[in-house]
Interface confidence: low
C-alpha cells in the first residue's frame, strides 16, 4: 500500500547532514611501487567562486620511514584559501599562485603550475613521475589524501567517471545533504524516525559507515528510531548521543562496543518502502530522510524532539 507521507525539505535548523566520501565524479588510483616520487593530482571545481579548503596529507609509514617524496598537483578553477596540513612529508606542491592563497606559509617546495587544460596537466604531472592518484572534486570543503595507500589494480592512472578512491582519498562536500521530513498520516503518538539511505558506490568492497547522530533533546523527551539502509556490503558503526531503536541493513555496532556486531534486517531499498518501514515501527513523523552517496562518515544533527516537526 502507498504510505502517505509527503517528503518536504525541513527548515535548516531542524536537521543537517554532512558526510565524508571516497566517491568522486572522475578519478583513478594506480600503483607505482618503485617510483621515488609519488604523484597525486587534484582537479578542484568551486562553482561558487572564492572558497576555503582544508587539505590534509597523511603518511602511512613503511618500515618506520617515509619512503619517497610526494608531488601534489593542485588545479583549481577559482580562488581558494588553503589550509594545508602535511606534517613531516617531503612535499612538492605545483599550483597556480594567482588562484591559491595559503592560510599560513606552506613550508614546502612549490612550483608554478602551467595554465594547461586537464589532459595536459596530467601529462605534465606524469612527466615528473608515475601518477598514483588523480581526482576531480566538485566544491570540496575538506580533503584527506592518504599517501602510500594506493591499492589500485592499474599501473597507469587514467581519469574515469564515477570512481571510488578507496582509502587513498576522502573528502567532504561543502553543501550539506538535502534533509526532508514528513508526517506519517494516521499514526498517533510522538515517535520520530530518522532515515538514512546510503546509495551503492562504484566499488563493492566491504565498507563500514560511521553514523554520528546528535539529537538536541533531553534524553527522556525522545522516542525515536534510526533506520539505516545501504548496499549489502555496508555495515554501520553508530555513535549516538541518545538511546533509540536501531533498524538497519547489514550489521551494526555501537562506538562504545565496537566489537559487538548486531545483525540487521533486510530492508526495502526505495524511499516509499523505507517510509512504510517507519510506519510499521509506529513512527508518526519522519524527522529526517536523507539519501547520500556511499560515505565513510555521516553526521546527523537534528532537533525535532518527538513529533513537533513541520514541513512546508
Amino acid at each position: 500500500e502507498t504510505v502517505h507521507c509527503d517528503l518536504q525539505p525541513v527548515g535548516p535548523e531542524r536537521g543537517e547532514v554532512t558526510y565524508t566520501t571516497s566517491q568522486v565524479s572522475k578519478g583513478c588510483v594506480a600503483q607505482a611501487p618503485n617510483a621515488i616520487l609519488e604523484v597525486h593530482v587534484l582537479f578542484l571545481e568551486f562553482p561558487t567562486g572564492p572558497s576555503q579548503l582544508e587539505l590534509t596529507l597523511q603518511a602511512s609509514k613503511q618500515n618506520g620511514t617515509w619512503p619517497r617524496e610526494v608531488l601534489l598537483v593542485l588545479s583549481v578553477n577559482s580562488s581558494v584559501f588553503l589550509h594545508l596540513q602535511a606534517l613531516g612529508i617531503p612535499l612538492h606542491l605545483a599550483y597556480n599562485s594567482s588562484l591559491v592563497t595559503f592560510q599560513e606559509p606552506p613550508g614546502v617546495n612549490t612550483t608554478e603550475l602551467p595554465s594547461f587544460p586537464k589532459t595536459q596537466i596530467l601529462e605534465w604531472a606524469a612527466e615528473r613521475g608515475p601518477i598514483t592518484s588523480a581526482a576531480e572534486l566538485n566544491d570540496p570543503q575538506s580533503i584527506l589524501l592518504r599517501l602510500g595507500q594506493a591499492q589500485g589494480s592499474l599501473s597507469f592512472c587514467m581519469l574515469e567517471a564515477s570512481q571510488d578512491m578507496g582509502r587513498t582519498l576522502e573528502w567532504r562536500p561543502r553543501t550539506p545533504a538535502l534533509v526532508r521530513g514528513c508526517h506519517l498520516e494516521g499514526v498517533a503518538g510522538h515517535k520520530e524516525a530518522h532515515i538514512l539511505r546510503v546509495l551503492p558506490g562504484h566499488s563493492a568492497g566491504p565498507r563500514t559507515v560511521t553514523v554520528k547522530v546528535e539529537l538536541s533533546c533531553a534524553p527522556g523527551d525522545l522516542d525515536a528510531v534510526l533506520i539505516l539502509q545501504g548496499p549489502p556490503y555496508v555495515s554501520w558503526l553508530i555513535d549516538a548521543n541518545h538511546n533509540m531503536q536501531i533498524w538497519t541493513t547489514g550489521e551494526y555496532s555501537f562506538k562504545i562496543f565496537p566489537e559487538k556486531n548486531i545483525r540487521g534486517f533486510k530492508l526495502p531499498d526505495t524511499p516509499q518502502g523505507l517510509l512504510g518501514e517507519a510506519r510499521m515501527l509506529n513512527a508518526s513523523i519522519v524527522a529526517s530522510f536523507v539519501e547520500l552517496p556511499l560515505a565513510s562518515i555521516v553526521s546527523l544533527h537534528a532537533s525535532s524532539c518527538g513529533g513537533r516537526l513541520q514541513t512546508s
Partner: antibody, heavy 118, light 106 residues
C-alpha cells in the same frame, strides 16, 4: 563587503504586475540562499519567498499569501535575484527587502517600496 | 505555521534601564533569531541562534531561551538602542517573524 541593492519598486494598480531585482556583490552569490521579506507601512516583517542555491537545485518556497502570484528566480551569472509579482493586491503594498540567509538573515538590502493602489 | 508572539509590543524606558523582550512560539523551536530595526532603515541581524551576538552588537545585549520561550535582554539601555526588535524562527516551515517590540525613550 556584502551589498544587496533592490530596484524595480513603484506604483501599480491592483491586478497589475511588477518585477523587483536585487543586485548582489561582495560574496559568492550562487552559493547563497536568497529571500524576499516585506514590511507593510507601519507593520512588522513578513517573509515572502526564498530560492536556494544551485547545490540545492534552486528550490523555491513561498508564503501562502503570495503562492501562485509571485515567482522568485535568480541569475547566478549576473549575481541578481528577482521577484516577479503578478495579480497584485492592495495588501501587497510594502517595502520589499532582499536578504541573504546563512543560519539567519545576515545581510539585508535597503528595500524598495511597492505601492498597489487604484 | 508557528506563531511568534512578542511582548510587550512597546516598552518605554530610560537610558540606563534594564529591558527585557520576550518572544513566545506556538510550538517548540530549535533557535530564535533577533533583528533590530530603526525607522526608515532595513533590519539588522542582532542575535542569532538564540544567544549569539551578531557582528558589531554591543555586549550589553544578550539572548536566552529554549523550547517555546526566548528573551532578548539589554542590561543598560543606551540612546542608540531605541528601536524595534523582531524575533524570527525557521525551525519549521514557513519561516515566521514576531510582531515586533518597539523600545521607546520614556
Amino acid at each position: 563587503e556584502v551589498q544587496l541593492v533592490e530596484s524595480g519598486g513603484g506604483l501599480v494598480k491592483p491586478g497589475g504586475s511588477l518585477r523587483l531585482s536585487c543586485a548582489a556583490s561582495g560574496f559568492t552569490f550562487s552559493d547563497a540562499w536568497m529571500d524576499w521579506v516585506r514590511q507593510a507601512p507601519g507593520k512588522g516583517l513578513e517573509w515572502v519567498a526564498e530560492i536556494r542555491s544551485k547545490a540545492s537545485n534552486h528550490a523555491t518556497y513561498y508564503a501562502e499569501s503570495v503562492k501562485g502570484r509571485f515567482t522568485i528566480s535568480r541569475d547566478d551569472s549576473k549575481n541578481t535575484l528577482y521577484l516577479q509579482m503578478n495579480s497584485l493586491k492592495t495588501e501587497d503594498t510594502a517595502v520589499y527587502y532582499c536578504t541573504r540567509w546563512r543560519r539567519f538573515f545576515d545581510s539585508w538590502g535597503q528595500g524598495t517600496l511597492v505601492t498597489v493602489s487604484s | 505555521d508557528i506563531q511568534l508572539t512578542q511582548s510587550p509590543s512597546s516598552l518605554s524606558a530610560s537610558v540606563g534601564d534594564r529591558a527585557t523582550i520576550t518572544c513566545r512560539a506556538s510550538s517548540s523551536v530549535s533557535y530564535m533569531h533577533w533583528y533590530q530595526q530603526k525607522p526608515g532603515k532595513a533590519p539588522k541581524p542582532w542575535i542569532y541562534a538564540s544567544s549569539n551576538l551578531a557582528s558589531g552588537v554591543p555586549s550589553r545585549f544578550s539572548g536566552s531561551g529554549s523550547g517555546t520561550d526566548y528573551t532578548l535582554t539589554i542590561s543598560s539601555l543606551q540612546p542608540e538602542d531605541f528601536a524595534t526588535y523582531y524575533c524570527q524562527q525557521w525551525s519549521s516551515n514557513p519561516l515566521t517573524f514576531g510582531g515586533g517590540t518597539k523600545v521607546e525613550i520614556k
